[in-house]
């Protein structure tokens, strides 16, 4: 699986999950989140050559098409597969509120 | 929706479904499929700016991150959303066999 265990410990050039830290204030302009100040969101990057973690029948066909037509602009793309939530704390007035933000952290990628 | 109805009738530059015809023999090297000789597989292409058909919380965050950090390599990617099957006919000896191939045709795209 193209997950953090594999990708963070390898020098994989093809589609894999990469490290990305997002600072809520600096990178998103969100000043209202109290905790955390930012988080390891990660992102997916890398080419999707033939047979590389292909998602559907279509992505297999497209990768094979790409192999036969190397100059074509039609190619599978490296995108998130498994996403995890992130708990945040923010204030409503003086009252802290804990919220679970779904699908915030990329754990693995796929070629789609 | 970034589907064939909208995308094929517009000059949309952002993420949209594009026309692509795949010839089984020439483009994939599959000589054994009798009918059809090829099919309109389509593909997804175009940038994914902030708020453009974003798939998850994460892709919204990433598009916003990208807006704040224009040089970054982390950005959502335009990929298939709705896929449709394709019926094919091939011969097993002299006997024709009809098979429904799942997830073969792109009907719409999303930013993931």
């Amino acid at each position: 699986a193209l997950d953090t265990n594999y990708c963070f410990s390898s020098t994989e050039k093809n589609c894999c999950v990469r490290q990305l830290y997002i600072d809520f204030r600096k990178d998103l302009g969100w000043k209202w989140i109290h905790e955390p100040k930012g988080y390891h969101a990660n992102f997916c990057l890398g080419p999707c050559p033939y047979i590389w973690s292909l998602d559907t029948q279509y992505s297999k066909v497209l990768a094979l098409y790409n192999q036969h037509n190397p100059g074509a602009s039609a190619a599978p793309c490296c995108v998130p597969q498994a996403l995890e939530p992130l708990p945040i704390v923010y204030y409503v007035g003086r009252k802290p509120k804990v919220e679970q933000l779904s699908n915030m952290i990329v754990r693995s990628c796929k070629c789609s | 929706a970034l589907d064939t109805n909208y995308c094929f009738s517009s000059t949309e530059k952002n993420c949209c479904v594009r026309q692509l015809y795949i010839d089984f023999r020439k483009d994939l090297g599959w000589k054994w499929i009798h009918e059809p000789k090829g099919y309109h597989a389509n593909f997804c292409l175009g940038p994914c700016p902030y708020i453009w058909s974003l798939d998850t919380q994460y892709s919204k965050v990433l598009a916003l991150y990208n807006q704040h950090n224009p040089g970054a390599s982390a950005a959502p990617c335009c990929v298939p959303q709705a896929l449709e099957p394709l019926p094919i006919v091939y011969y097993v000896g002299r006997k024709p066999k009809v098979e429904q191939l799942s997830n073969m045709i792109v009907r719409s795209c999303k930013c993931s």
């Epitope: - | 054994w32 091939y90 011969y91 000896g93």
Partner: antibody
């Protein structure tokens, strides 16, 4: 060059299952049908079935239907043949063989080295 | 199923001999202008090797002393001048009908 490398010999008890692997290299794995053929000791060749790796489409010989499953892992270009409810008359050398590509059922131009499966109590 | 009958089941021959092996199918294997009949060679302990496909087409890398002919139900594999490396078992195979079937084999031995 095209190569099909099969897993090693197996000894199984009657009623058990066996899974033989066949790793392909030197060609586009998803563009050709992969066949499985067996040969009992001193006997002729018997076709078991086939699979098209890109689509997972299968055709099984009637004699093996319900007892055999053919699968592939396109990420490793490997084909698998699992035979269940083994009997002593399943003792044979099992071959994977690539179809030449013009039809589903076809001549077979490249063969694995064979895997001997012995079924004995 | 289409039955494939090879004859003879074995034969003895000398180096330089012309050898002919026949294969008869229980029904015609002709379709779409092709004869769906193929020939293989197998040596002891080895996998079969494709010699001839579609009745008369020589597989790449196979010596030209091997040739195939026939149509309908009757087919022939000919070795024009037998060489020491040709001593082996030969099989015919049809693919016009599911299941794909092989002949029982012809063993070519040294006289």
């Amino acid at each position: 060059q095209v190569q099909l490398v099969q897993s090693g010999a197996e000894v199984k008890k009657p009623g058990a299952s066996v899974k033989v692997s066949c790793k392909a290299s030197g060609y586009t794995f998803t563009s050709y049908w992969m066949n499985w053929v067996r040969q009992a000791p001193g006997q002729g060749l018997e076709w078991m079935g086939q699979i098209f790796p890109a689509l997972g489409s299968t055709n099984y010989g009637e004699m093996f239907e319900g007892r055999v499953t053919m699968t592939t892992d396109t990420s490793t270009s490997t084909a698998y043949m699992e035979l269940r409810s083994l009997r002593s008359d399943d003792t044979a050398v099992y071959y994977c063989a690539r179809g030449i590509g013009n039809y589903a059922l076809d001549a077979m131009d490249y063969w694995g080295q064979g895997t001997l499966v012995t079924v004995s109590s | 199923d289409i039955q494939m009958t090879q004859s003879p089941s074995s034969l003895s021959a000398s180096v330089g001999d012309r050898v002919t092996i026949t294969c008869r199918a229980s029904e015609s294997v002709d379709w779409w202008g092709n004869s769906f009949m193929h020939w293989y060679q197998q040596k002891p302990g080895k996998a079969p090797k494709l010699l001839i496909y579609l009745a008369s087409n020589l597989e790449s890398g196979v010596p030209s002393r091997f040739s195939g002919s026939g149509s309908g139900t009757d087919f022939t594999l000919t070795i024009s001048s037998l060489q020491p490396e040709d001593f082996a078992t030969y099989y015919c195979q049809q693919n016009i009908e599911d299941p794909l079937t092989f002949g029982g084999g012809t063993k070519v031995e040294i006289k």
